[in-house]
Interface confidence: medium
Amino acid sequence: KEEQITFRDCADVFRSGLTTSGIYTLTFPNSTEETKAYCDMETGGGGWTTIQRREDGSVDFQRTWKEYKVGFGNPSGEHWLGNEFVSQLTNQQRYVLKIHLRDWEGNEAYSLYEHFYLSSEEFNYRIHLKGLTGTAGKISSISQPGNDFSTKDADNDKCICKCSQMLTGGWWFDACGPSNLNGMYYPQRQNTNKFNGIKWYYWKGSGYSLKATTMMIRPADF
């Protein structure tokens, strides 16, 4: 019986010769469990595994811990890939994280972290980041050192106010911190002075809710 080719991430997919952007089936490290992910094969040389996308407000991001763990939405549209998969993947080897942002005025910016990984669920999928470059602010809008992940039903932030409940969405909240790319989606002309929107403080300030965001990862040695 012919052995089926499995892909760990979109870099594997790209290296196999499949260089068209789209949805591919990826396999968890050291497991047969599978997940579907959107592979961006064009941005900066391709091979990017998309772990989050916001673009139109079609998906509710005010989800439970379990939903953020396993992922939700459609990889071709708005979605969260899943903390468990991302944690397992990013603990296998060194990954970079690229966050691409778009505002309502047509401007685009990005933040690139040269080293990214998530702790295991035991440690609440705490985010670890090093080496920020890019155009979306000189200071990291994801608080450093990294925080545990919080959702509406699992509060691990550093605020008495319970950030996930107030800001909506699951995120690595501090108290509550300068970002939340999983906040409420606000349409154009309703996107300012919004405390609970899609926020990246060191690019657009505190009250501005973004039009579109993509978070994607790729092995550092790609």
């Epitope: 039903d153 509060d155 008495i160 106010c161 319970k162 409940q165």
Partner: antibody, heavy 117, light 107 residues
């Protein structure tokens, strides 16, 4: 519709005990930290205690004035939060309100606790 | 503990007046401040949180401002139903503390 209904208040002698209950409905109780706030007759508001979630190991915080005497707890299966009050003092006389996570959007109607000999 | 000092403790005003209540924190609380309205025999109602965000259903005549240690609640045009006692609260650190209250009475 969100509802918080307190019960268990009443007249008690100094040194006595009471257990207040707060039954919650209309929201996902298990997702909210819960608090007790009290108001002495003709006075302002005073925060008393807070209990967090299962994911926080039901961590608690107390005002210094009640620490060691009052215990906050919750029963998720009954959507109820409790305040066990022991060694009551006359200065504990107040209306006790059950509320949600700070800042407090949901309030009960309050239950009056009178500590008097 | 963080003290929240509210002033004035009471004020008299007429319908249509602009009313300003201030609250001073004894140390920096960022914007972790809420304002409540309470009428006699009733539970308090949340008006403003995070210093300036109006709670759902609160009329636009109520506004909050400030950060750090100095906070203000403004009622732009006082209505008959606004005569009540107002409290500020900090939720930046434990113990959570309230101001002493400001009673707004009819002149």
């Amino acid at each position: 519709e969100v509802q918080l209904v307190e019960s268990g208040g009443g007249l008690v002698k100094p040194g006595g005990s009471l257990r207040l209950s707060c039954a919650a409905s209309g929201f996902t109780f298990s997702n909210y930290w819960m608090n007790w706030v009290r108001q002495a007759p003709g006075k302002g508001l005073e925060w008393v205690a807070e209990i967090r979630l299962k994911s926080n190991n039901y961590a608690t915080h107390y005002a210094e004035s009640v620490k060691g005497r009052f215990t906050i707890s919750r029963d998720v299966s009954k959507n109820t939060v409790y305040l066990q009050m022991n060694s009551l003092k006359t200065e504990d006389t107040a209306v006790y309100y059950c509320t949600d996570t700070a800042p407090f959007a949901y309030w009960g109607q309050g239950t009056l606790v009178t500590v008097s000999s | 503990d963080i003290q929240m000092t509210q002033s004035p403790s009471s004020l008299s005003a007429s319908v249509g007046d602009r009313v300003t209540i201030t609250c001073k924190a004894s140390q920096d609380v960022g914007t972790d401040v809420a304002w409540y309205q309470q009428k006699p025999g009733k539970a308090p109602k949340l008006l403003i949180y995070w210093a300036s965000t109006r709670h759902t259903g609160v009329p636009s005549r109520f506004s909050g401002s400030g950060s750090g240690t100095d906070f203000t609640l403004t009622i732009s045009s006082l209505q008959p139903e606004d005569f009540a006692t107002y409290y500020c609260q900090q939720y930046s650190s434990y113990p959570l503390t309230f101001g002493g209250g400001t009673k707004v009475e009819i002149k």
